[in-house]
Every structure is written in C-alpha cells, then in structure tokens.
Interface confidence: medium
Amino acid sequence: EPTMYGEILSPNYPQAYPSEVEKSWDIEVPEGYGIHLYFTHLDIELSENCAYDSVQIISGDTEEGRLCGQRSSNNPHSPIVEEFQVPYNKLQVIFKSDFSNEERFTGFAAYYVATDINECTDFVDVPCSHFCNNFIGGYFCSCPPEYFLHDDMKNCGVNCSGDVFTALIGEIASPNYPKPYPENSRCEYQIRLEKGFQVVVTLRREDFDVEAADSAGNCLDSLVFVAGDRQFGPYCGHGFPGPLNIETKSNALDIIFQTDLTGQKKGWKLRYHGDPMPCPKEDTPNSVWEPAKAKYVFRDVVQITCLDGFEVVEGRVGATSFYSTCQSNGKWSNSKLKCQPVDCGIPESIENGKVEDPESTLFGSVIRYTCEEPYYYMENGGGGEYHCAGNGSWVNEVLGPELPKCVPVCGVPREPFEEKQR
Amino acid sequence: IIGGSDADIKNFPWQVFFDNPWAGGALINEYWVLTAAHVVEGNREPTMYVGSTSVQTSRLAKSKMLTPEHVFIHPGWKLLEVPEGRTNFDNDIALVRLKDPVKMGPTVSPICLPGTSSDYNLMDGDLGLISGWGRTEKRDRAVRLKAARLPVAPLRKCKEVKVEKPTADAEAYVFTPNMICAGGEKGMDSCKGDSGGAFAVQDPNDKTKFYAAGLVSWGPQCGTYGLYTRVKNYVDWIMKTMQENSTPRED
C-alpha cells in the first residue's frame, strides 16, 4: 500500500547487525509523487566497492547508489549523512552483510518522504503538445484558443473536418492558408458529386508547401486523396510532387490532411471539378464498335458487332451483335458480353472410332477422328480431320459436316496360322 | 478338320460357331455372317458365337453370342423334304443378318469377300485355309478350333472319290462350276461339323489379307477331297442382299 513517508532501519539497529544477512525494503509512494530518501546514520563495514557489507538503492533497473563505511553530516544543522531524490514512485533498498565482521558495526537508519514532481519540467519528454500545468501529485494539458484537447488528454488540434462539397466545381485549402497550418491536426474534406461524374483534382506546384519527408522518406505532414479503393498520395514537400491533374474515376473523394507537432508550412490549395465519367475505349477482340470515337463518356451508346466466326453468347442464344452504354460508374453496360469464338461443341462420337478430346472446340480449332486400329479403318475418306467453321459445325474438306465412318478391316488375322509339321 | 492342327481364334478371327446344327460360318462385316445354305435350312434362328478358340459350354458363356435377325438362303438352293438324302449342293450359300453389330477386336474380325476381277479366279494348287470344330481323327466334334492348309484341286478329283455312305447312286451327286474342289494332300480335309466355314485364300492384291474363296459345303469322304461353294460366283447376290437389308445408318 503506498505511503507518504517511512523509516528503514538495519537489522538490530542501533545494535550491531548480524553476519550473513540479506534484507530488502520496497518503498512505494502514491502515483504522481517522487521519493526523497535520506540516511541519518551509516556505520557499515568498509570494503572496496562495498563488496563485503552494503546498502543498495535501486530504482527500476538502475542502481541509484551503494553505501558502506561510516558517514557523518557535513551540515551541523542537519542530521542527513546521505540522500537520494528520484522522480518515480517506487524504490528498493537492499541490505547485505557477509559471513564475518572485523569490528562491531551498528548499520544504518534511513527515512523517506513523498515529494511532488513537476511533470512539465522534470522529464526529457514533454507530456503536453501545447501548455503543461503542474499540480501536487500530477499535471494537466491545455490548448490555445481555437484548438481542442484530443481524447488522449495530451495533444491539441484544430477542428477542421466535416465539410462536404457537392458542387460540380470548387476550391479547397488547408486551414489558415496561406498562413501556416495548425500542428497536430487531422483535416478531412469530402467531395460528393452526382453519379456519372468523376472528381478531377487540379493543383499547381506553387500552391503546395507541406513539411518535407524524413530521411526514411515518410511524410511527417501529409495530404492523401482516397477514391473508393484507390489512393493517391501521401504527398508532402515544397511544391506538389504528384500529378497536377488527378482523374479519380469516382464521384466520391475524401481528402485527408494530417499534421504532426512541428514544422508548420503554408499548406495547400486545390481546385476540383466534375467530369462526365469516361468509359475506357476497350480493346474488345474480334469485334467492331459503331460509332468509332476517340473518347466515350457517361451516357454514350455503342453497337458492338462480332467478326466472322465469333458470336455473343447470351443464355443459350448466339447473337452477332449487342449494344453497350457508358454507365455512371465508368463501366460499360453488357461488359460481360464478349465476342467469343463460335463453339462447335464437343464433337459427336463415332462408332468404332474416337476423336481425341480437343484442346479447344472453338472457331478454327482442329480435331482428328481415328478409327480403332487395326480392326477398323476410315471408309469414306477425308482423312478424319475436321475444323470448327464459322457456322458452328465441324467441317471436313472432303465430307463437309458428314462424319467419318469406321468399318471393319477384313481378312487380317491377329496371328498367322502355323500348321502342325508332319 | 481332318489332319489339321490346333488353331487359335486369333488365327481365324472371322470363324463363327453355330451350335445347332454344329457348324461354322464366316463373319463378313458387322452385321452379316456368311455360311452354307444346308447349315441354316433346318434352323432359321441359329445361335452363333464368335471370339472363342474353344466351344466348351463354359468358354462359350464367356464369348460373344450373335443373335440372328433374318436368314437369307440363296434362291438357287433347292429345299428338300428329306435333306439327309441330298445329292445336289449347288448354290450352297446363305447370309445371316444380325440384330446387333459385332464389335471387332483381336479375336473377332471379318474376312474379305473376293473381288470380281480375274485375279480372284482360283488355279489348281492355290492354297487355302480351312478351320472349324467339326469331326477330327479322334472325335466327332473338336473342342478347340482346328485348321488345315490345303490346295485347290481339279473338280474331277472330287468326282473320282467314292462317296463313303451314299444315300443315292454315285452318279446322282451334282458337280457344278459353283463348287471348288480342294484337298487330297496329307489327308487334310474338312468334315462333318465344319460346314459353312471359310476356305480362306490369300488376297492376290494384298498379301496381308485373306478372302473367303469358298465355304465348306460337302464331300464324298472325310480325309480325301472336299467341295466348297465358290463365293466369287455369288458376290453380286451377297452385295445386293446386304444393301437391300441394311439400316439407314449402315448406308
């Protein structure tokens, strides 16, 4: 249980302490206080590095001191012979004696009291981003005007989020632009345009000045654009390092500006506008687009017609063309429809013959029928080779779509007859 | 087969076995079996087997049974009230149309038919192979397929042999150009139970193949000379019968 003060005496004090003793005291004062430990009496067998007998003062993993020998006060008005001040609320005192004493030693008497620490000045790391206020047993942080204290109760930032921009054209800048932006802040801006329009952001290089990246290339302050699952940035430095025109391919854009505690610059300014969503001029194989244009945008309609030997398979019906509309999401309608090679299907099997499982049954593919040799041969010629024609049939040069016919080979015994020798 | 050797069905994959009467036939394609008219005249629904060297019951159970759809006997074959007394075996040829096509393989495949050109005219001394499960020197019926190689002989050689158990005068037996005489060498001959089987001759235009030059028909005495139906004379009838009685799929 933490206490505000206390006394620590060596065993048998003020009598001589026994040999072969090891005793420890764990001192704990309330949180927010330091410890002042002082010795009023010290009479311990003297040895080099206090190797024989000693009293040890440990704070955490650090040895604050190791004492032995006889001490007397330097100050006639004070009984203190040795003292320690630690800014932590826990301390350990360990007393050790070895197996023999040359003389009679009386040990030590020590006292501790809880002392206030100034968290605002006593530590290397400043606990508050802006103003630090000390009080006995603790401290609190506070912020300048127009800043607010974050949930961590240590950092201050400005309230710069929540703006939603819905106009087809607009301008957005960092807080206070072109004056330095506030430190330790996260500003989020949302652009939400009508579906079918994509947000296009334009920046001039000179309209951008944000604290530069560290030696590892990580932005300390950063500007990030997020459009759906696509991200542009983070950007930082003097002069905009990204593309001056950012086509987001989305009608929704989030702009996130994050700053740290130091190094405020003038910030940034950008313009945005809504473009009708472009649809890619897709390279759809084996087809022709009508009308042919350099660029297609939201609400454009094209007719896609398949080349010979290709068809659009929709359900079970094969067609040779289809219509596609540029949609609000920048994608073509019917985009799943493709001009696929005509599929002649699995070739028909033939009696007493086989067709190797074709690698492909599509337009232009070639299959070969063979008869079950050596018992059957191909009677109606044509060599057995068929190709998948544009009309979806397997066709042979000689027989056309007619299948080959395998007929038995006659008159060939599998083994010759050898008659009995007489 | 008299004076023959054990054979394997792989040596004669066209050989068909008829169990009633005990006789032979020759497979000529997936749907047709060629045999002698006298084999099927008394049983128009013969049970046939292919693919087995042995005709023991257990072996036949494992071989391929053929079911007839229809029997076509040559119109020139004279049907008799008492077939046992027959002396005229002219036009001894018949076709059996099968219900289902036969699957070919190492033990089952057809024999070719003769061509119509003069290349397929037989000369004395030309060798042919006969096979069957008919009478042997040791038993009335063979269990395992037997075969023999024998030469074509002049028809007179067959006429000169005295008929063993004549059912009529020797002069009553009819000999015609539709018959081939063969045998007379080393006692090799076909015999009772071999009827309908092929007399197989090497194709003059393709030495790897055999064609049915004849069908085992009749003979004066087993172990001498035998008479075989001359198939070449019936090729037109065979082709016409098959064409007229085929399914559209076969065409």
Epitope: E415, E418, E419, K420, Q421 | S5, D6, D8, K10, T53, S54, Q56, T57, S58, R59, T136, K138, R139, A142, V143, R144
Partner: antibody, heavy 118, light 107 residues
Framework: QVQLVESGGGLVKPGGSLRLSCAAS????????MSWIRQAPGKGLEWVSY????????YYADSVKGRFTISRDNAKNSLYLQMNSLRAEDTAVYYC???????????WGQGTLVTVSS | DIQMTQSPSSLSASVGDRVTITCQAS??????LNWYQQKPGKAPKLLIY???NLETGVPSRFSGSGSGTDFTFTISSLQPEDIATYYC?????????FGGGTKVEIK
C-alpha cells in the same frame, strides 16, 4: 519319341524365387499348348498353369496367380515357370505336360521337386 | 471352380476282379472328362479322354462312361500291373481340376 524333361527344382526359402524349365523333344513343340501340374508329397494332382501355342494366351490357378509366370521359347523347344514369393504350400513335384487334342494331357515329364522351407 | 469328387479313395481287389471308380462333378461338364493312371514314383499317364474314348495304346480292359455330372471308370479284369492311383480330370473350364485320386491295390 515324345520326351519332356523338367529341371530347376531344389530347396528354397519362403519368399524366394525359382525358375523351372521343361525341355521338349520328339514332337513339334510350337504346335502344342503346354501345361504345368504339381503334386504335393503324398497328395493329389493340382493344375498350375497353361500357355497357348504362340504364348499369347495364359491361364493360372488362383493359388499361384500374381506369383507364377508361365512362358515358352518355341525356338528353343522350352517351357518355363518363373515362381516368385514362394510359400511352404508350394512344395511339390512339378510336372510339365503336353496339352493335346482338346485339353487331354497326353504326355508328362518325370517331374522336378521344389521344396520351400526355412 | 468345378469340384471333382472321386470315390472310393482306395480299394483292394483280386487279380481278375472288375474294378469300378466313380467321379462326380459339382456342375454339368458334358463329356469333358479324362482319366489318368499314376504309378508310384512316376508321372501320370492318359488312359481315357472325352469320358469314354480310349487313348491309343491303352489296353481295352480300361473303359469309361458317363456325361453331365456322373462318370464311371472301369477295369474289367484287374491285372498286377494295374496297381496305381487313378485320377479323373475335368476340362470343361479353367482352372482344370482333378479328383482326389483312387489308390488301387491287389489283395
């Protein structure tokens, strides 16, 4: 006269292998089917295996299937029986026989004794 | 497999006696049955094939009969040289199977 002489028998440990041979003379070997038959000491006859004239068809008794292999060399007038994974119950006199006239075994060799014992 | 049951397993008869051995098949084997004679220390010898046909060179006192499942082997007049074990064998189907044998001795 027809003669069949078996050889290759002997003592072998269980799991071991042995190859029996049968030398034929006095007849045209390639004209005949051939068989192996065995007879355990004091017991009856047990057919083991058969091979066709060309060697294309072979049959085996269930008791030896997968362990024994019958073969022939018509050029050498010889019949063979390769016996692997031998067991004590394979101990017998092994005869080779000519398979004549539809499955009658008309000529037999004098036999060779195979003893399988550890 | 087709089982062949032969009986008796042994018999003793006098010279000149008529000796009969029977063989029963576990299923119909038509006439696909052979009879063999094996003298002590010798290889078997074919006597009868196809149930009733006498092999060339075999004395006529040996005969066989039967068809289907029941078969009989007869020695019409037993001779001293007939002391042997006699086996029936079916060849209707593989595996070929033999009867257990009948040992014939002279009284």
């Amino acid at each position: 006269q027809v003669q069949l002489v078996e050889s290759g028998g002997g003592l072998v440990k269980p799991g071991g292998s042995l190859r029996l041979s049968c030398a034929a003379s006095g007849f045209t070997f390639s004209d005949y089917y051939m068989s192996w038959i065995r007879q355990a000491p004091g017991k009856g006859l047990e057919w083991v295996s058969y091979i066709s004239r060309s060697g294309s068809t072979k049959y085996y008794a269930d008791s030896v299937k997968g362990r024994f292999t019958i073969s022939r060399d018509n050029a050498k007038n010889s019949l063979y029986l390769q016996m692997n994974s031998l067991r004590a119950e394979d101990t017998a006199v092994y005869y080779c026989a000519r398979d004549q006239e539809d499955y009658a075994l008309d000529y037999w060799g004098q036999g060779t004794l195979v003893t399988v014992s550890s | 497999d087709i089982q062949m049951t032969q009986s008796p397993s042994s018999l003793s008869a006098s010279v000149g006696d008529r000796v009969t051995i029977t063989c029963q098949a576990s299923q119909d084997i038509s006439n696909y049955l052979n009879w063999y004679q094996q003298k002590p220390g010798k290889a078997p010898k074919l006597l009868i094939y196809d149930a009733s046909n006498l092999e060339t060179g075999v004395p006529s006192r040996f005969s066989g009969s039967g068809s289907g499942t029941d078969f009989t082997f007869t020695i019409s007049s037993l001779q001293p040289e007939d002391i042997a074990t006699y086996y029936c064998e079916q060849y209707e189907d593989y595996p070929l199977t033999f009867g257990g044998g009948t040992k014939v001795e002279i009284k």
